[in-house]
Interface confidence: low
């Protein structure tokens, strides 16, 4: 098992940000930052951001970093899964993606990291400030779960701003992070921090809802906020909930499974069929060490978009191939 | 029809060794992670160890580590668990278990059990 | 690791009687599952992510609860359901079930 610390990648430049101020200079310390505030924790990161050209669009993007497999993701919206969530994708490593109205697109970005644009019509629609959930299956880590929402004055095209924060669902350990990595990125980050003290930065304040980590103000649009990190532990609640779905999803999961050509008989028609979306090759995951589990190799990529799906009434835990149909 | 059938129990002192046997049938078994759950005399169960598929990954409580070993053969359909320093407490039914992992770690399949007893 | 404690231990209930037992984890979960043993065999899958009927599960049984608390409820028991039920759980490491609740036949 390889021992680098894995760092958030940042999200393409917005167009015609490389402006005087220098886009990378910008950008380092709050990676830096970022790794600060959540070194030794388990790393779940959500992003929201409102697309400019189309004012009711989203982009999702979340992100795991542990040293497990992950085995699957889920994102919701109007709160956890499992806990008043509406299910609006499901994407699995090996056995492709399902998603539901109103979310158009979804996809893995990373071995670790997906993203989800949302439809912004329809009486579905989500608001400006719903909360959206993603959770992360690891084997043997368990799951985790963080949620993020825009700000209620974030302009459109703009992200939301890095918050970190514990989240409430997160049932495990701190997983170690790389101290070396860490403690030098800290170092740096402070050194940097002096050099540009002239330049606007947004504040850190105590989190209201939460002793344990800091959560960042939001700030108004700049350089450094457009171009944002990949966060930790995004968790803003609001109180918008979503428009019930024209699948409904009892005890906020999917209405699983469409009917789709299989040796099993007797299965339920269900709302879509799975995406077969090729999966990107997973060899650039870098993980942490972590003491609890024992060492072992990467999984190794699926790389055909063909997958045999084998539906159930029980919903996905039931199909045959548990860690894919290799 | 989905079969699980432990073997390989039996009666040892503590200190010595055991492996235990698992066929599969019934479903595809390389496609599936495999667990050993053991349900001690007090009729407790207790999960032993875990290994996925494609990748091979293992995993085990503390209790176990170190000295048990999972594994498992694709070609035969074989899931195993090789017990060493076996104590006193280990004696328990050991059963074979497939599991789904694809929503979380629910266990689907289990075997008939075979008997472990550790005893001098 | 995370201590699941059910209750109660042991209860009976006669046919046709609403039954309820409850799994208590010593921190939150994310999702529990339910497990039948009858005398003589081996357990078997009920309820998986909380609230899921497993495969030829009866409808009469149902799961719900989150974070700490959750419960398994028979609506209507009948002579099959004697058995020891077990919750499970694997949000954290390790694996860890309750120690289950017998159900008997009044």
């Known amino acids: 098992m390889r021992t680098e610390a894995q760092v958030p990648a940042l999200q393409p430049p917005e167009p015609g940000l490389e402006g005087a101020m220098g886009h990378r200079t910008l950008v380092l310390p709050w990676v830096l930052l970022t790794l600060c505030v959540t070194a030794g924790t388990p790393e779940v990161w959500v992003q929201v951001r409102m697309e400019a050209t189309e004012l009711s669009s989203f982009t999702i993007r979340c992100g795991f970093l542990g040293s497990g497999s992950i085995s699957l993701v889920t994102v919701s919206w109007g709160g956890p899964n499992g806990a008043g969530g509406t299910t609006l994708a499901v994407l699995h490593p090996e056995r492709g993606i399902r998603q539901w109205a109103p979310a158009r697109q979804a996809r893995w970005e990373t071995q670790s990291s997906i993203s989800l644009i949302l439809e912004g019509s329809g009486a579905s629609s989500p608001c400006a400030n719903t909360t959206f959930c993603c959770k992360f299956a690891s084997f043997p880590e368990g799951s985790w779960e963080a949620c993020g929402s825009l700000p209620p004055s974030s302009d459109p095209g703009l992200s939301a701003p890095p918050t970190p924060a514990p989240i409430l669902r997160a049932d495990l350990a701190g997983i170690l992070g790389v101290s070396g990595v860490l403690l030098f990125g800290c170092v740096y980050l402070l050194h940097l921090l002096r050099r540009h003290k002239h330049r606007p930065a947004p504040r850190l304040q105590p989190s209201r809802t939460s002793p344990q980590a800091p959560r960042a103000r939001a700030w108004a649009p700049s350089q450094a906020s457009q171009a944002a990190l990949h966060v930790p532990y995004a968790t803003i609640n609001t109180s918008c909930r979503p428009a019930t779905l024209d699948t409904a999803h009892p005890h906020g999961g999917p209405s699983w499974w469409a009917s789709l050509p299989t040796h099993a008989a007797h299965r339920p028609q269900g709302p879509a069929a799975w995406a077969s979306t090729p999966i990107p090759a997973r060899g650039s995951f870098v993980s942490v060490e972590n003491g609890l589990y024992a060492q072992a190799g990467e999984r190794p990529p699926h790389t055909g978009p063909g997958l045999t799906l084998f539906p159930d009434p029980r919903g996905p835990r039931a199909m045959e191939g548990p860690l894919g149909v290799r | 029809e989905v079969q699980l059938v432990e073997s390989g129990g039996g009666l040892v002192k503590p200190g010595g060794s055991l492996k235990l046997s698992c066929a599969a049938s019934?479903?595809?078994?390389?496609?599936?992670?495999m667990s050993w759950v053991r349900q001690t005399p007090a009729k407790r169960l207790e999960w032993v160890a875990t290994?996925?598929?494609?990748?091979?990954?293992?995993y085990y409580p503390d209790t176990v580590k170190g000295r048990f070993t999972i594994s498992r053969d694709n070609a035969k359909n074989t899931l195993y668990l090789q017990m060493r320093s076996l104590r006193s407490e280990d004696t328990a039914m050991y059963y074979c278990?497939?599991?789904?992992?694809?929503?979380?770690?629910?266990?689907?399949?289990w075997g008939q059990g075979t008997s472990v007893t550790v005893s001098s | 690791q995370i201590v699941l404690t059910q209750s109660p231990a042991i209860m009976s209930a006669s046919p046709g009687e609403k039954v309820t037992m409850t799994c208590s984890a010593s921190?939150?979960?994310?999702?529990l599952y339910w497990y039948q043993q009858k005398p003589g065999s081996s357990p078997r899958l009920l309820i998986y992510?909380?609230?899921n009927l497993a495969s030829g599960v009866p409808v009469r049984f149902s799961g719900s609860g989150s974070g700490t608390s959750y419960s398994l409820t028979l609506s209507r028991m009948e002579a099959e359901d004697a058995a020891t039920y077990y919750c499970q759980q694997w949000s954290s490491y390790p694996l860890t079930f309750g120690a289950g609740t017998k159900l008997e036949l009044k």
């Open positions: 921190s939150s979960v994310s999702y």
């Open positions: 290994i996925t598929s494609g990748d091979i990954r293992t």
């Open positions: 278990v497939g599991h789904d992992d694809f929503h979380f770690y629910a266990m689907d399949y």
């Open positions: 992510d909380t609230s």
């Open positions: 019934g479903f595809t078994f390389s496609s599936y992670a």
